[in-house]
Amino acid sequence: TPEVWVQVRMEATELSSFTIRCGFLGSGSISLVTVSWGGPNGAGGTTLAVLHPERGIRQWAPARQARWETQSSISLILEGSGASSPCANTTFCCKFASFPEGSWEACGSLPPSSDPGLSAPPTPAPILRAD
């Protein structure tokens, strides 16, 4: 069964800067990745970035840089200042649309005990929804 993992890390140098990494563990090719915060995309969450293998990448503040790390994983740097800045308990969600398998989504947040700049290794997060 395909799985999605989400890793959230706060940068040690900038405490309002977060790095979100997400990956898809499945055999299909990725057709779209959507990163949101505040909950799953379409369920109250706000879209931060959308990545498409051919058409490119779209990102919205406070997203600073979204990119493909591999064919099945992405990273997103958020830089916050003011009302739109993320906080330590913010939930980030990644939805992978895989062709032809369907859509898989998982969410994660900063581990409560983590020091800035440190985080647990990426492990599959609970799958919230499979379309």
Epitope: S29, S31, L32, V50, H52, E54, R55, G56, R58, Q59, W60, F99
Partner: antibody, heavy 118, light 107 residues
Framework: EVQLVESGGGLVQPGGSLRLSCAAS????????MHWVRQATGKGLEWVAG???????YYPGSVKGRFTISRENAKNSLYLQMNSLRAGDTAIYYC????????????WGQGTTVTVSS | DIQMTQSPSSLSASVGDRVTITCRAS??????LGWYQQKPGKAPKRLIY???SLQSGVSSRFSGSGSGTEFTLTISSLQPEDFATYYC?????????FGGGTKVEIK
């Protein structure tokens, strides 16, 4: 209500220039990709330009180097500067929003007519 | 560039008929395809996006299917207001390209 209103069309001679405008309202204009699509009388739809929320621009080969798409987010406005116009550019020009990127245009204006003729 | 071949270019049908329009992409586009309806003198209106998702406010008699290179728009029971021209659009890669259109006329 989401609305797009084009203006600036008219009659122009071959080799001339024209600038089309599109006024957007009812949505957060700065977030969305925007496009121009044209349709010659009795013909099909042809995509002629696109611009993303970061200002990067995209064109088909048929207009590259002649047409320039731009946006002014503070004025909720989209533009199409058309230079070196040809008779084949005669068409209705539609402004369109791609509100759910990358799923194509979801909202269209009513169009403005461009006629290139001597 | 990706070519979109739409068929038929025109068809005649009666109210209540089931109508099927096909779009074929020159290369795989996954499910990055939309369907549009256009009536004379009007702007196009999106019916379907992402190959099979129904646009909000559009009647459920319209449905889309397919992936990869073969796509279909189906009108389950043609209504008088459905007589129009239909276009497919691939949004998989630039340049964005439309099919040539299918004119649905009254038989």
């Amino acid at each position: 209500e989401v609305q797009l209103v084009e203006s600036g069309g008219g009659l122009v001679q071959p080799g001339g220039s024209l600038r089309l405008s599109c006024a957007a309202s009812g949505f957060t204009f700065s977030r969305d990709d925007m496009h121009w699509v044209r349709q010659a009388t009795g013909k099909g739809l042809e995509w002629v330009a696109g611009i993303d929320n970061a200002g990067d621009t995209y064109y088909p080969g048929s207009v590259k180097g002649r047409f320039t798409i731009s946006r002014e987010n503070a004025k909720n406005s989209l533009y199409l500067q058309m230079n070196s116009l040809r008779a084949g550019d005669t068409a209705i020009y539609y402004c369109a929003r791609e509100g759910q990127w990358p799923y194509g245009m979801d909202v269209w204006g009513q169009g403005t007519t461009v006629t290139v003729s001597s | 560039d990706i070519q979109m071949t739409q068929s038929p270019s025109s068809l005649s049908a009666s109210v209540g008929d089931r109508v099927t329009i096909t779009c074929r992409a020159s290369q795989g586009i996954r499910n990055d395809l939309g369907w549009y309806q256009q009536k004379p003198g009007k702007a196009p209106k999106r019916l379907i996006y992402s190959a099979s998702s129904l646009q909000s406010g559009v009647s459920s008699r319209f449905s889309g299917s397919g992936s990869g290179t073969e796509f279909t728009l189906t009108i389950s029971s043609l209504q008088p207001e459905d007589f129009a021209t239909y276009y497919c659009l691939q949004s998989n890669s630039y340049p964005l390209t439309f099919g040539g259109g299918t004119k649905v006329e009254i038989k």
